[in-house]
Structure formats: C-alpha cells, structure tokens
Amino acid sequence: MKVLQEPTCVSDYMSISTCEWKMNGPTNCSTELRLLYQLVFLLSEAHTCIPENNGGAGCVCHLLMDDVVSADNYTLDLWAGQQLLWKGSFKPSEHVKPRAPGNLTVHTNVSDTLLLTWSNPYPPDNYLYNHLTYAVNIWSENDPADFRIYNVTYLEPSLRIAASTLKSGISYRARVRAWAQCYNTTWSEWSPSTKWHNSYREPFEQHHHHHHHHHHH
C-alpha cells in the first residue's frame, strides 16, 4: 500500500482543516488508514482523524481544531496499521479556504432597489471576520446569458442594486462567496442560492429599453 498523491490540506481558519490524498489502488480509507495530526506547541496532544473514501483510491479527512493563530504549524502522519506511509506538515494560515457566507436574503420592499444581505461566516474574535470581501452572483432562471458578478470590496455583508438593472417580471437567483486578501485565500464555496421575482414599475419612456443590461465581472 502506497500513497500516490500526497495529502494536501486547506483550512477554514477557524475549526476545520480538510486533507485529501490518493492511494495507489482501491482503499477502504476508514478501516485501513489513520491520519495523526499534532499542533507544534506546548501541551498539544496528538489527534487521530479517521478518513473517509473520496472515490475509489481517494481519501479525505476533516481535522478538528480548537482555534488557530497565524503561526500555527501541524505535523501530519499517515498510518496504515503500524506502517508510516507519509509524514508531512501543514500551516493553516498558508492554505485558507474561507467558510461560505450564509443567510442570503433579498429584500425587495425598498422602492426600486434590491437589498441583498448575508451573514459573515466568522465570529468577531476570528481574524477573518474583518477581512472578508465578497462576490455576489445573480442570474436569471429564464436566460442563461443573463449572468452577472458583483464584487463587494467593503466589509459590510450587503449589496444594493437598482431593480431596473435586472429584467422585470422574471425570476432571479443569487448566491454569494467570500475570500480574504490578507491570507491570499482561495474563494469559499458559494452560499445556497436564494430566489426572488423581480418586478418594478418602469417609467413609460424607459419601457422600450428594459431588456438592456450590463454584465459585471
């Protein structure tokens, strides 16, 4: 039994780091393998992660962590019974994939304005709480070409757009994801999408132009 692709890990910079690797053949990850991890710090105990299968020869392990600081470094040991298959280390701050934002809501009760709000996925004591920026994706369920991205580069988890920038009388969906420049993170996963029916009263003189819209990237 050998490791074909060494473990690579990403951290949510709060409580979970996820490591994935591939073996050289079909493996029952949970019964045959164990990933031991230990913070390089005083008093730290070794923890055992039981991997799950991720495709025939792939394994994935979710490492639970109480907290995280920038300087953290973990030792990783992959065992098959008494045999050490691989030894490595992992610095969570260098491989961050933020948690996905949640609670995306579209408020349509403001006259001719759409207000999208969502929740920051981190508590205030986490460094990323004040360092996330967001991308909001809005698309039409009726027209695949009507797809746009709004970059939210301020800290407030909200976006205001004029309802008239979208077509009236059709349904739209929105979703949001996050990243943090400070740790050069990857993008988070998208939040669950939310749906609303876009309707607004157009001034008569704009009526013939309501199909025009801009794509934002």
């Epitope: 709060m14 409580s15 979970i16 390089v40 710090f41 005083l42 008093l43 109480d66 907290d67 600081v69 920038s70 300087a71 953290d72 981190y122 508590p123 205030p124 004591d125 460094y127 004040n130 400070c182």
Partner: antibody, heavy 116, light 112 residues
Framework: EVQLVQSGAEVKKPGATVKISCKAS????????MHWVKQAPGKGLEWVGR????????IYASKFQGKATITADTSTNTAYMELSSLRSEDTAVYHC?????????WGQGTLVTVSS | DIVMTQTPLSLSVTPGQPASISCRSS???????????LEWYLQKPGQSPQLLIY???NRFSGVPDRFSGSGSGTDFTLKISRVEAEDVGVYYC?????????FGQGTKLEIK
Amino acid sequence: EVQLVQSGAEVKKPGATVKISCKASGFNIKDTYMHWVKQAPGKGLEWVGRIDPTNGYTIYASKFQGKATITADTSTNTAYMELSSLRSEDTAVYHCVSRRPWFAYWGQGTLVTVSS
Amino acid sequence: DIVMTQTPLSLSVTPGQPASISCRSSQSIVHSNGNTYLEWYLQKPGQSPQLLIYKVTNRFSGVPDRFSGSGSGTDFTLKISRVEAEDVGVYYCFQGSHVPYTFGQGTKLEIK
C-alpha cells in the same frame, strides 16, 4: 520552563498613562493569543482583551475599548498593555495570560495604583 | 454580553467532604465551531489563577482527579469529591466561546 514575567508595580496620578509588560519564556508568543485580565482589589476577574501577536489583531471587552491598548513585540517575545486616562477605578492587578486554547499560563500580575 | 452566574458565592466544607459549585450562563456558550469553551479556575490566596477544567469536563494536566466538571447548554457544575486543605481559594467559571469572554463572580471555598 514556561514563564510569563510581568513588569513591576506602578503608582500613577489620575489622567496619566501606564504601560505594563509581560515577557514570555519557554514558548513563542506567536504561537498563542495573549490576553489581559483585570482584578480590582478584593474583586473578581474581568477579561480586558487579547492580541494575536503575529498579525496584531486585537479585540477588547467594550468596557475597555479606548481605555486599554494591547500590543506585542514578537522580536522580544513580549506583550504589552497600555492604560490611558487613568482613574481610581483602574486601580487593580492586571494579569497577562497566554491562551491556546485555554488559560494555561498566567503572569504573576502587575499592581497599578491610581492615586492623587 | 454573556453573564456567568455562580452559586453559592461562598462555601465552607469539612475536609474529606464533597463540594459542588454551579455556574449558569445567560445564553448558550456553544462556539460556532461546535465546542463549548467552559473552564474552571482556582485562585489560591496570594497567587495567580490556575486552570482546573477546560471544555466543560477535561481536567488540565496535574489537576487531581477529585476535581470534575459537568454540564451542557447553560448549566455547568464543578465538583470536588473530597475537599482537602489545599483546595481553599476562589473558584471562577469562565466562558471563552463568545466575545467578550466573561468570568463568573467567583465562589470562595474555605475549610471548616
């Protein structure tokens, strides 16, 4: 041996500023959060705030926002807390504590007395 | 802010007898990572506080097994199965789950 050694007692006049230090040995403060805890004479423990020494990220209890400023110097392995606009109610023992992720190591405390 | 309320505020116990201290939080102290950072500290006379229990039930290294922690949600308890003379001091519960972190007001244990 792990130790947090704090600076000595201070006596200050109302309105003054004081800066107390906490030097760590036996570990690197970059590997922990450094917290400060207040204990007024004959009273209980009160959390002031904390710093991540690597990036300088601080959070404070709202009561101490504007009163306390926590800093750290990773080159000397030392955390600091400055208390400004001192008043008699700031008279207390202030403890530095390392948390990873619980308060395992405490400094001996620094008594700050505010008196005219 | 989460208020941590300890009862009783003082306790007088005969050596060898059990003691129990309750700590109630004003709201849930489950952290967003799923853990409950409820800790117990003992401050002996003239000393800095020392850690006894972390994450509700875990004894810190070197802490005698006569100390135990229990509880969940908003109700937590520290028990000393047989009090010894060296256990005198003030016991504090602490929540490190939500900012601002908060201590209970303390329970003074003395020996009869």
